[in-house]
Interface confidence: low
């Protein structure tokens, strides 16, 4: 699987999850998030050669098409597969609120 | 929606479904498919600016991050959302076989 366990330990050029730390205030301008200050959102990147973790029949077809027609601009792209939530603390006035934001952390990628 | 109805009628630079005709024999080397000779597989391409058809909270966050950090290599990618099957005819010996291949035609795209 193209997950954090594999991708963070290997110098993998092809589609894989990459570490990306996002600071809420500096990177997003989100001053309203009190805790955490930031988090590892991660992201997916890298080429999608033929059959690499193909998501659908279409991505398999497109991968083969791209191999045989490398000048074509049509090719699968490396995108998130499994995502996890992130719990944040923010304030409404002086009242603390805890909320779980869904699909915030990329754990694995696929070629779609 | 970034579907064929919208995308094929507009000169849309951002993420959209694009027409792509694939000839089974010439483009894929699939000589075993008897009918059809080819089909419109289509593909997704185009930039994913902040909030454009964002698939998840992560793609929204990544879009904003990329807007505020344009030098970053992390950004959402335009990938298939809705796919449709394709019915094909092939032969096993002299026996004709009809099969429906799932997820063969891209009908709409999203930023993931």
């Amino acid at each position: 699987a193209l997950d954090t366990n594999y991708c963070f330990r290997n110098l993998e050029e092809n589609c894989c999850v990459r570490p990306l730390y996002i600071d809420f205030r500096q990177d997003l301008g989100w001053k309203w998030v009190h805790e955490p200050k930031g988090y590892y959102a991660n992201f997916c990147s890298g080429p999608c050669p033929y059959l690499r973790s193909a998501d659908t029949t279409h991505s398999t077809v497109l991968g083969l098409y791209n191999t045989l027609n490398p000048e074509a601009s049509a090719s699968p792209c490396c995108v998130p597969q499994d995502l996890e939530p992130l719990t944040i603390l923010y304030y409404v006035g002086r009242t603390p609120k805890v909320e779980q934001l869904s699909n915030m952390v990329v754990k694995s990628c696929k070629c779609s | 929606a970034l579907d064929t109805n919208y995308c094929f009628r507009n000169l849309e630079e951002n993420c959209c479904v694009r027409p792509l005709y694939i000839d089974f024999r010439q483009d894929l080397g699939w000589k075993w498919v008897h009918e059809p000779k080819g089909y419109y597989a289509n593909f997704c391409s185009g930039p994913c600016p902040y909030l454009r058809s964002a698939d998840t909270t992560h793609s929204t966050v990544l879009g904003l991050y990329n807007t505020l950090n344009p030098e970053a290599s992390a950004s959402p990618c335009c990938v298939p959302q809705d796919l449709e099957p394709l019915t094909i005819l092939y032969y096993v010996g002299r026996t004709p076989k009809v099969e429906q291949l799932s997820n063969m035609v891209v009908k709409s795209c999203k930023c993931s």
């Epitope: 092809n14 080429p47 050669p49 191999t67 045989l68 490398p70 000048e71 601009s73 090719s75 792209c77 | -």
Partner: antibody, heavy 125, light 112 residues
Framework: EQQLVESGGGLVQPGGSLRLSCAVS????????VNWVRQAPGKGLEWIGY???????YYASWANGRFTISKDSAKNSVYLQMNSLRAEDTAVYFC???????????????????WGPGTLVTVSS | EAVLTQSPGTLSLSPGERATLSCQSS????????LSWFQQKPGQPPRLLIY???TLTSGVPDRFSGSGSGTDFTLTISRLEPEDFAVYYC????????????FGGGTKVEIK
């Protein structure tokens, strides 16, 4: 650092054969397309062909038949086999990688980068 | 087979002057923008300056710019620096033809 280094050049007689090697480092041949380009002394650049990351080789029409491109991904090497060499094949031979544009192999935009330093092939009796 | 014609063959200019180099393709390049520009100095391999007709490669000074689409392309050097005197080549990518790539004959930019 991503690098390509050619080797195998030298003096060869007309009608002879030669195999050039392109050793790559810093990237995987299963992810990138590698081209061969040549340049005759005092002349312009001429595209010979490439081998794609998937293993398919494509050639310029003039090179088809005499020149063969192959690779050994395990050895991180791309090869150019040249047969029936002529005086007009005298040139510096470069290997160059397709640059990766975007997060997927969306086409190289005709961008070759990086390049090797080149190796000189002289065809003469 | 596509042919790329560069003009002029030689351009004699002084440092500080503007240089305009032309590249014309006998057929449209793939996607109308698969066109690159390279700089080459004696005894060195070519150096990629611009790809996709107008995108500057990282580390290339912004006095270099590329424009054009389809069959007609231009490389402009706004103010020539001493290190810019070299030979410049354009290269095009093509789909459907046996020759996937072609280089122009080159333009030599020399000191007047």
């Amino acid at each position: 650092e991503q690098q390509l280094v050619e080797s195998g050049g030298g003096l060869v007689q007309p009608g002879g054969s030669l195999r050039l090697s392109c050793a790559v480092s810093g990237f995987s041949l299963s992810s990138y397309t590698v081209n061969w380009v040549r340049q005759a002394p005092g002349k312009g650049l001429e595209w010979i062909g490439y081998i794609s990351y998937g293993g398919s080789a494509y050639y310029a029409s003039w090179a088809n038949g005499r020149f063969t491109i192959s690779k050994d991904s395990a050895k991180n090497s791309v090869y150019l086999q040249m047969n029936s060499l002529r005086a007009e094949d005298t040139a510096v031979y470069f290997c160059a990688r397709h640059m990766q544009v975007g997060g997927a192999p969306t086409g190289s935009m005709a961008a070759f980068d990086p390049w090797g330093p080149g190796t000189l092939v002289t065809v003469s009796s | 087979e596509a042919v790329l014609t560069q003009s002029p063959g030689t351009l004699s200019l002084s440092p500080g002057e503007r240089a305009t180099l032309s590249c014309q393709s006998s057929q449209s390049v793939y996607n109308n923008n698969y066109l690159s520009w390279f700089q080459q100095k004696p005894g060195q391999p070519p150096r990629l300056l611009i790809y996709g007709a107008s995108t500057l490669t990282s580390g290339v000074p912004d006095r270099f710019s590329g424009s054009g689409s389809g069959t007609d392309f231009t490389l402009t050097i706004s103010r020539l620096e001493p290190e810019d005197f070299a030979v410049y080549y354009c290269a095009g990518g093509y789909s459907g033809s046996s020759d996937k790539y072609a280089f122009g004959g080159g333009t030599k930019v020399e000191i007047k």
